[in-house]
């Protein structure tokens, strides 16, 4: 895990002092990952509580800073940073000693192998003539007489150390403040030197430049300023992190910074610096973290305190000890990635004198299997061997090694192989919207296996169909529209995900059933006629240019622009071509149109018709009755309507022979004050039906119908005539 805890020892003022924890993990800060934690760990080294609570400042998801110290005692003790997710969650510890302590460690972090002897050494900073107590994780461990100091140092020798011996050790003068102690950290690897893994049977890769082999996974934890699977490569000055991606802040570079990395590395100064405050440059001939490495450059190489030997032309190697005549493996990726089940070709190029040939180059897998090259390409400056790898399994993940051996010598280069599992969707794609001939689909699905997702293939076909699936490659971050589908049809839709590289296609995910909408009703009706059948009634007729292929009925829309109101009349019968609209508002101008509909979809509207309904008339006249006066005369009498809607302009009388089939006849009573009429010219001995209505602006309702017969046998009349008068 790429996690670094930094303390800036140049800052002595507690109020300005801060600690920073940086995560360089790929994908660090994914929303699913727990955040970085940076805190003081008071479980072993307890000091007085700080005057004010410490506070964390986050710089994005990959960096966190702890501030808010108020007095020197706040700084003394153990700080921890926790980062990474799941099984890779890692804790990095930093132990801070007080610059004014009685005793001070010669070296704070000690990393040793199982079974080694560890020597912790504290030098006297302020002498006190009392015994020195050594503690382990806060518990009493040993006592030394003050006179046992050797050359001003108290030493604790721990023989045959085992992993449980790991922890925080302290050396304190009896009866002195614990803040004046020298605090140490001992890290005991779970294996002997050069070994790792369960049972410690696996060989470490041979970490260079002070890198420490992790006892669980065999990876090198590289000192700050070095990178590569074996820490073989120096970063540019002022850079750190597993890929040299981080930079020391400010103009001073890494001067005065102490770097703490995941166990079993511990803490050290940055490359090129040493001393308790990491402010001293390496002495000539020394380089690396804490200046622990010696250059010992040969063949005219010069020592650089950050990167080691800089070799002249014609020489290479850590000490410039390898002539370019000795075979040398040329640049290779330090880490490669393949998909499970693939049979990749791995190339390894080497130069040297004598020239490497086919049999001189081999590839070693993590399980020890040796592969011979299947093909060799010889060029003037190099030989490239190509290795065909059998079908990869997850067990092939780990460190592979390319080896070259000639009579001039040998060389090897390790590289890490990561075997990845192609992604397989766990969920079906999601329907976002639909129309008659298209579906809008979200291809984003959760998946098992490894990312990143390089492409998404969407497959679809009609439900219960055996035809080939239609395929479309889509952008995983964008919704996709499936076009030219059949209306009202179910489609099975499924997703296939791919990750980069050959064989990166995963299996199909579960399919979702998505159904397209009804087809649009594509016919436009035409309004053929519209008749006012009363102040609040309208009969409408329409036509269609042809029989509709799809349609459930018609929607008639009446728009009353003056009131801003719309009325919709649903005619749920696709064969209908006429409708009677009732309950309309008398005296209103309407704009009328008609559309065909199917399911919830509307077809195009007809051109609108403009209809004016007449105002409503008055109520019916009251108490109409009839009386025969002779064989040709009948008198009608009535009373005015109740509360007419304005001044009555006339009355209309309707006369019809009872039981007859002829049309009725109407007579106007033009003087509205008259409420009586004598109808003359009727046929003798004939029964008649009468009713009457008033007119204001519009015609009113008819009164009740009355029946009356003329008297005796008289002459046949030409037809009724009237005489009216006021009642």
């Amino acid at each position: 895990v790429d996690l670094t805890l930094l303390a800036n020892l140049r800052i002595t003022d507690p109020q300005r002092f801060f600690l920073t924890c940086v995560s360089g993990e790929a994908g660090a800060g994914r929303s699913s990952d727990p955040p970085l934690l940076l805190e003081k760990d008071d479980r072993i080294v307890r000091t007085f509580p700080p005057g004010q609570p410490l506070y964390l400042a986050r710089n994005g998801s990959h960096q966190v800073t702890l501030r808010g110290f108020s007095k020197p005692s706040d700084l003394v003790g153990v700080f921890s940073c926790v980062g990474g997710a799941g099984a890779r969650r890692t804790r990095v510890l930093y132990v801070h000693n007080s610059p004014g302590a009685h005793l001070f460690p010669d070296k704070v972090t000690h990393t040793v192998n199982k079974g080694d002897t560890a020597v912790l050494s504290a030098h006297v900073h302020k002498e006190k003539q009392t015994d020195v107590i050594w503690k382990n994780n806060g518990s009493y461990f040993n006592t030394l007489d003050w006179q046992e100091a050797d050359d001003g140092r108290f030493q604790l020798q721990l023989q045959n150390v085992q992993p449980p011996s790991s922890g925080i050790y302290s050396a304190t003068y009896l009866e002195a403040s614990p803040l004046g102690s020298a605090f140490f950290r001992l890290i005991v690897r779970g294996c002997g030197a050069g070994r790792w893994g369960p049972g410690c049977v696996k060989d470490c890769p041979g970490c260079l430049h002070g890198g420490v082999c992790h006892d669980h996974d065999g990876e090198c934890v590289c000192p700050p300023g070095f990178t590569g699977t074996r820490c073989e490569q120096a970063c540019r000055e002022g850079r750190f992190g597993q890929s040299c991606q981080e930079q020391c802040p400010g103009t001073a570079g890494c001067r005065g910074l102490t770097f703490c990395l995941p166990d079993p590395y511990g803490c050290s100064c940055g490359s090129g610096w040493r001393g308790s405050q990491c402010q001293e440059a390496c002495a000539p001939g020394h380089f690396g973290a804490d200046c622990r490495l010696q250059c010992q450059c040969q063949n005219g190489g010069t020592c650089d305190r950050f990167s080691g030997c800089v070799c002249p032309s014609g020489w290479h190697g850590v000490h410039c000890e390898k002539s370019d005549r000795i075979p040398q493996i040329l640049s290779m990726a330090t880490e490669v990635e393949f998909n499970i089940g693939t049979m990749p070709r791995i190339n390894c190029a080497a130069a040297g004198n004598p020239f490497p040939v086919r049999g001189s180059m081999k590839l070693r897998k993590p399980d020890g299997t040796m592969l011979l090259s299947t093909k060799v390409i010889v060029e003037p400056d190099r030989t490239t061997a190509e290795f065909e790898v059998p079908s990869l399994t997850l067990g092939d993940s780990g460190f592979w090694e390319c080896r070259v051996s000639t009579s001039g010598g040998q060389d090897s280069r390790r590289f890490k192989v990561n075997v990845k599992v192609p992604p397989v969707p766990l969920t079906a794609p999601r329907l976002l919207a639909k129309q008659s001939r298209q579906l809008v689909v979200s291809p984003l699905v959760s998946f098992s296996g490894d990312g990143p997702i390089s492409s998404v293939r969407l497959h679809y076909r009609p439900q219960d169909s055996t035809i080939a699936w239609s395929a479309i490659v889509v952008d995983p971050s964008e919704n996709v529209t499936l076009m030219n589908l059949k209306p009202k049809t179910g489609y099975n839709v499924r997703v296939q995900l791919s990750r980069p590289g050959e064989g990166g296609e995963g299996g199909w995910g579960p399919s979702a059933l998505m159904t397209t909408d009804c087809p649009e009703p594509l016919l436009q009706p035409w309004l053929e006629s519209w008749h006012v059948e009363g102040p609040d009634r309208l009969r409408v007729s329409w036509s269609l240019p042809s029989v509709p292929l799809s349609g459930d009925g018609f929607l008639l829309r009446l728009w009353d622009g003056a009131r801003g109101q719309e009325r919709r009349e649903n005619i749920s019968f696709p064969q209908a071509r006429t409708a009677l609209l009732t309950g309309l508002t008398p005296g209103t101008h309407y704009q009328l149109d008609v559309r065909l509909y199917h399911c919830t979809l509307l077809g195009p509207a007809s051109p609108p018709a403009h209809v004016h309904l007449p105002p409503s008339g008055p109520p019916a006249p009251r108490h109409l009755h009839a009386q025969a006066l002779s064989d040709s005369e009948i008198q009608l009498m009535w009373q005015h309507p109740e509360a007419p809607s304005g001044p009555i302009s006339k009355y209309i009388v309707e006369i019809q022979v009872a039981g007859g089939s002829g049309d009725p006849q109407w007579m106007d009573v033009d003087r509205p004050e008259e409420t009586s009429i004598i109808v003359r010219g009727l046929n003798a001995s004939t029964r008649y039906l009468f009713r009457v209505r008033a007119s204001v602006q519009g015609l009113g309702d008819w009164s009740n119908t009355v029946e009356e017969a003329t008297l005796g046998n008289g002459l046949q009349s030409e037809g009724p005539v009237r005489e009216s008068r006021a009642a």
Partner: antibody, heavy 120, light 107 residues
Framework: EVQLLESGGGLVQPGGSLRLSCAAS????????MVWVRQAPGKGLEWVSV????????GYADSVKGRFTISRDNSKNTLYLQVNSLRAEDTAVYYC?????????????WGQGTLVTVSS | DIQMTQSPSSLSASVGDRVTITCRAS??????LAWYQQKPGKVPKLLIY???TLQSGVPSRFSGSGSGTDFTLTISSLQPEDVATYYC?????????FGQGTRLEIK
């Protein structure tokens, strides 16, 4: 072959009137709605009016409502546009076109147009 | 009334380029949209009807898509003879309004 031929355009003073005609042939005229579309010089297309196959249903753009009247004589296979109270902004080429009967929404058949110029 | 807005109002492209003209309706019009091509002094020519159906005889480099309020006319590989003004028109409700037009020229 479907043919539409407009006539009746010309120079007219503001406030004046014209009657545009569109003679149709090559199809059953009484089965199709018909439209008028106009285009002012150097400008875009403007939909003007529509009439149903029977002539009973008409529609107009707001800019011509109350001044223009569309009609048809199915016995003569002719479409008309009576244009009254003409204004300078009515100056345009007037096209007649056959309305779709449904399913294919677009005007495929157009006449060659007749130019109406309103100027004093 | 439904307003139809075309963009851009004019554009210049090279022969072989992919050209896209968009048309936006002020309210939903389903698929009831047509595209026309008009060359100077000529009658408009129907290219696409009912939003996406290619009129018989029109080259396949022309295509239409969209529904509701947003529509697109695409010329997959511009040819010299495609220089013209292009119009969209809605048929959802009267008046059957046109877009203001897009003038296309060759660079």
């Amino acid at each position: 072959e479907v043919q539409l031929l407009e006539s009746g355009g010309g120079l007219v003073q503001p406030g004046g009137s014209l009657r545009l005609s569109c003679a149709a042939s090559g199809f059953t005229f009484s089965m199709y709605g018909m439209v008028w579309v106009r285009q002012a010089p150097g400008k875009g297309l403007e939909w003007v009016s529509v009439i149903s196959p029977s002539g009973g249903n008409t529609g107009y753009a707001d800019s011509v409502k109350g001044r223009f009247t569309i009609s048809r004589d199915n016995s003569k296979n002719t479409l008309y546009l009576q244009v009254n109270s003409l204004r300078a902004e009515d100056t345009a080429v007037y096209y007649c076109a056959r309305a779709p009967r449904g399913y294919s929404y677009g005007y495929y058949y157009w006449g060659q147009g007749t130019l109406v110029t309103v100027s004093s | 009334d439904i307003q139809m807005t075309q963009s851009p109002s004019s554009l210049s492209a090279s022969v072989g380029d992919r050209v896209t003209i968009t048309c936006r309706a002020s309210q939903g019009i389903g698929h009831y949209l047509a595209w026309y091509q008009q060359k100077p002094g000529k009658v408009p020519k129907l290219l696409i009807y009912t939003a996406s159906t290619l009129q018989s005889g029109v080259p396949s480099r022309f295509s239409g898509s969209g529904s509701g309020t947003d529509f697109t006319l695409t010329i997959s590989s511009l040819q010299p003879e495609d220089v013209a003004t292009y119009y969209c028109q809605q048929f959802n409700s009267y008046p059957h309004t046109f877009g203001q037009g897009t003038r296309l020229e060759i660079k």
